[in-house]
């Protein structure tokens, strides 16, 4: 059968029918339904939601919808022994305590099972000591403290502001600095946009609002007790002492009213410069300890959370492909939330729900996609991407042979300014072409394409007339698919104006105030941005699953490989003498990139010209496209990060959220001037260059003519 026969209607008409079926009103209704009570991973409420979604996806018309369960390590506060932080006087009396819960939003006062703010996977402990303010607790912040200011954090409790980097990296840095505890807080400078009111009167963070979140350093491992393997009934589980990525010191998050009380008494060294000062009415002294009259007072943490193996549930829906049922396009997003999940994740889950409904309508009219589409509602994303990772571990053999693409669907909005896309270079052209066909929802761009408004508001730094597309990092459910398995991946959402809004994430992220009303009143009253995101995500899935030739352009990979090679070469060239001394050369890497570029160009010509009616040839060319991303996987993984196996991209070692290019070389070069054995350090740089060179060359050869 030809593709058009199998799908009953012409491909163009299919896509239009699919997009036209998506309705803002439905997304709004689904969001409301998903946000009335908390859906914390591992709770009965979230299991019930899984069953509801299973039932509705079946009604929508999917071929099958299954729940898959795993027993993974989760973490919860002790219900009878709350976590808090005290200022204690010389007699040990508590003279100030941080709050035990957030003041609930209006209308939600009687909701039960709102988990109080906590840092998931914090060990128990009651450390006591002087406070040291460490800014954002980034690598460079600790360099400034330890190397420039000669401040020793050993035995101290550090207080760090949220923002800039993933909280798990902050905790890891504090541990390495010798801290005995970590206090994380939201500074108004990062979480209170000027000229906007606090919730419930606006979208800013109130002083009592607190960001929850896990503080793991899993590096892609999934369940900390079963790295590499699914956490099923017969899984071997490590002991807690051997678990992957757990923090070793107590950690607790607070809001800025509590932070005010802790920071206002700080003494010791002044902050090094204005980049260390937030916007609280405090001096932002670094410490250690309190000033003058208060110097005998100390800070004490009281952390009693417990980690326990708990059952989680993914929902996996299947829409079988008519022509290539053994090729999978996956649309996945998580279902579990910290509290109500008004934005994270339910603004994404509601979009997925509507996409499933639209595909289901087409199927009921006799249509099927060319390839199989899998829909996933992941559990326990907030606890370390556990649901998606365990499922991928369980199905890794199928996925690495059959996985065409993964589209992520967490929060649909983090603002309402313009589109934000992170994806593999293979998907650049797909995204550009799709957004040219979609209408912009932005004010002032009526009748214009999404591509046009996106390009105007978020221009590419390299190519004029094109929009910015960023590298994939981590911190979301695409991680296992892209970084471990090498399946082409992408994500899209509506975002804020990064030029004018300096806050990190949206202010109410992971707080009790992330409600349906937040979205409906302040972010997207007409749900037009949600609809646009549904069209982008759904449109990408549609094209990936239904186009005769996979909508991947390998030439775009060639372009970025050259850019990344230039970038890493320039970093290395900051040490010209050492490069000479240790005979470090990037010639081989540039040669491999050149080869890749030439082979990709020839492949694209063949792709344009081959006989698309020949099913064997078609499958062969599509397989070369599908397996190109896979070719960038090194089975040995990155140094000390075995589950980050992509040689071109990995989450930054200093910020899980950010993507780093040529991460093996980058990490080998990082802070190399401080290494005790320069010969060994530069040897490792050379080893990483050779791995990158081999991988790029090997990937290029997968695009060569097969015989």
């Amino acid at each position: 059968k030809s593709s058009s026969e199998a799908t009953n209607i012409t491909p163009k008409h299919n896509m239009k029918a699919f997009l036209d079926e998506l309705k803002a009103e439905n997304i709004k209704k689904f969001l409301h339904n998903f946000t009335q009570i908390p859906h914390l991973a591992g709770t009965e409420q979230n299991f019930q939601l899984a069953k509801q979604i299973q039932s509705q996806w079946k009604e929508f018309g999917l071929d099958s919808v299954e729940l898959t369960h795993y027993d993974v390590l989760l973490s919860y506060p002790n219900k009878t022994h709350p976590n808090y932080i005290s200022i204690i006087n010389e007699d040990g009396n508590e003279i100030f305590n941080t709050s035990l819960f957030e003041p609930p939003p209006a209308g939600y006062e009687n909701v039960s099972d709102i988990v109080p703010p906590f840092s998931a996977f914090s060990p128990q402990g009651m450390p006591e000591g002087d406070l040291v303010y460490v800014n954002y607790a980034r690598t460079e912040d600790f360099f400034k403290l330890e190397r420039d200011m000669k401040i020793n954090c050993s035995g101290k409790i550090v207080i760090a502001r949220y923002g800039k980097v993933f909280r798990g990296n902050k905790v890891k840095n504090a541990q390495l600095a010798g801290a005995t505890g970590v206090i994380l807080y939201s500074d108004p400078d990062d979480y209170f946009a000027p000229g906007v009111k606090s919730y419930p009167d606006g979208w800013n963070l109130p002083g009592g609002g607190v960001q929850r979140g896990n503080i793991l350093n899993l590096n892609g491992a999934g369940d900390p007790l079963t790295p590499g393997y699914p956490a099923n009934e017969y899984a071997y589980r490590r002991g807690m002492a051997e678990a992957v990525g757990l923090p070793s010191i107590p950690v607790h998050p607070i809001g800025y009213y509590d932070a005010q009380k802790l920071l206002e008494k700080m003494g010791g060294s002044a902050s090094p410069d204005s980049s260390w000062r937030g916007s609280l009415k405090v001096p932002y002294n670094v410490g250690p300890g309190f000033t003058g009259n208060f110097s005998t007072q100390k800070v004490k943490m009281h952390i009693h959370s417990t980690s326990e193996v708990t059952r989680i549930y993914n929902v996996i829906g299947t829409l079988r492909g008519a022509v290539e049922p053994d090729r999978y396009v996956i649309l996945g997003g998580h279902r579990d939330s910290w509290v109500f999940g008004g934005i994270d994740p339910q603004s994404g889950a509601a979009v997925v729900h509507e996409i499933v409904r639209s595909f289901g309508m087409l199927k009921k009219e006799g249509w099927r996609p060319r390839r199989t589409i899998l829909f996933a509602s992941w559990d326990a994303e907030e606890f370390g991407l556990l649901g998606s990772t365990e499922w991928a571990e369980e199905n890794s053999r199928l996925l690495q042979e059959r996985g065409v693409a993964y589209i992520n669907a967490d929060s649909s909005i983090e603002g309402n300014y313009t589109l934000r896309v992170d994806c593999t270079p293979l998907m650049y052209s797909l995204v550009y072409n799709l957004t040219k066909e979609l209408e912009s929802p932005d004010e002032g761009f009526e009748g214009k394409s999404l591509y046009e408004s996106w390009t105007k508001k978020s221009p590419s730094p390299e190519f004029s007339g094109m929009p910015r597309i960023s590298k994939l990092g981590s911190g979301n459910d695409f991680e296992v698919f892209f970084q471990r398995l090498g399946i082409a991946s992408g994500r899209a959402r509506y975002t804020k104006n990064w030029e004018t809004n300096k806050f990190s994430s949206y202010p109410l992220y992971h707080s009790v105030y992330e409600t349906y009303e937040l979205v409906e009143k302040f972010y997207d009253p007409m749900f037009k941005y949600h609809l646009t995101v549904a069209q982008v995500r759904g449109g990408m899935v549609f094209e990936l699953a239904n186009s005769v030739v996979l909508p991947f352009d390998c030439r775009d990979y060639a372009v970025v490989l050259r850019k990344y090679a230039d970038k890493i070469y320039n970093i290395s060239m900051k040490h010209p003498q050492e490069m000479k001394t240790y005979s470090v050369s990037f010639d081989s890497l540039f040669s491999a990139v050149k080869n890749f570029t030439e082979i990709a160009s020839k492949f694209s010509e063949r792709l344009r010209d081959f006989d698309k009616s020949n099913p064997i040839l078609l499958r062969m060319m599509n397989d070369q496209l599908m397996f190109l991303e896979r070719a960038f996987i090194d089975p040995l993984g990155l140094p000390d990060r075995p589950f980050y196996r992509h040689v071109i991209y990995a989450p930054s070692s200093h910020n899980k959220y950010a993507g780093e290019s040529f991460p093996g070389i980058y990490d080998a070069l990082f802070d190399i001037e401080s290494k005790v054995d320069p010969s060994q350090a530069w040897g490792e740089v050379k080893r990483q260059i050779s791995i990158a060179t081999f991988t790029v060359q090997a990937a290029a050869e997968t695009l060569s003519e097969v015989a």
Epitope: Y84, I95, F96, N97, T98, S99, L100, F101, P103, P104, A106, E109, S198, G207, G208, Y257, D258, Q260, K261, E264, K281, N293
Partner: antibody, heavy 125, light 111 residues
């Protein structure tokens, strides 16, 4: 309309106990800190105690420390003052008051914006 | 005794202005915001000024607050007969870990 209504006052002998209540309505009680303030006959205002919205913090005037306990039941929208070992000098009109929000700090460090009409406590033998 | 000191009384004729001072220390006025309360005879106190100089809605702009260092003042311009009342300054005290009221000032409108 925001309203605070105190009750539980009366005449009591020195050394005995009394519990005052303050019923709140017209606002989201669970999100506010709450104070007790008293005024002895013909005297000025004297702050007695404050409790945070979640009871994580309770502060007392030195004159009542160890004898009085402030508490709240958020499910009942009610504030309490348990007064033990009462003395003649505790004779006063007792007001409950809502903590004042100013956006820069926890409300319980900011004083009061809404007051009840008061309940009279007389400690006399 | 109170740690915030106010003059016991102040007076003025209708239309005149009157200023009440409130003297404290670095642990109260010096480091925390000042509030002013008005207590009309036989009634509960009422918030007049918060955060040093902010007026709640419904309070006439004849009332204004200011703060400098460890002292604060309340100014009443265009005195009216209904302004006859007791006025209290107040602030949190970090050393006492408690809220403190001033000694109170009785304002009399003459004539």
């Amino acid at each position: 309309e925001v309203q605070l209504v105190e009750s539980g006052g009366g005449v009591v002998q020195p050394g005995r106990s009394l519990r005052l209540s303050c019923a709140a309505s017209g606002f989201t009680f669970i999100t506010y800190g709450m104070h007790w303030v008293r005024q002895a006959p013909g005297k000025g205002l004297e702050w007695v105690a404050v409790v945070s919205f979640d009871e994580s913090n309770k502060y007392y005037a030195d004159s009542v420390k160890g004898r009085f306990t402030i508490s709240r039941d958020n499910s009942k929208n009610t504030l309490y003052l348990q007064m033990n070992s009462l003395r003649a000098e505790d004779t006063a009109v007792y007001y409950c008051a809502r903590a004042l929000r100013d956006g820069n700090n926890w409300d319980y460090f900011n004083g009061m914006d809404v007051w009840g009409q008061g309940t009279t406590v007389t400690v006399s033998s | 005794q109170s740690v915030l000191t106010q003059p016991p009384s102040a007076s003025g004729t209708p239309g005149q202005g009157v200023t009440i001072s409130c003297s404290g220390s670095s642990s109260n006025i010096g480091s925390n915001t000042v509030n002013w309360f008005q207590q009309l005879p036989g009634t509960a106190p009422k918030l007049l000024i918060y955060s040093d100089n902010q007026r709640p809605s419904g309070v006439p702009d004849r009332f204004s607050g200011s703060k400098s260092g460890t002292s604060a003042s309340l100014a009443i311009s265009g005195l009216q007969s209904e302004d006859e009342a007791d006025y209290y300054c107040a602030a949190w005290d970090d050393s006492l870990n408690g809220y403190v009221f001033g000694t109170g000032t009785k304002v009399t409108v003459l004539g």
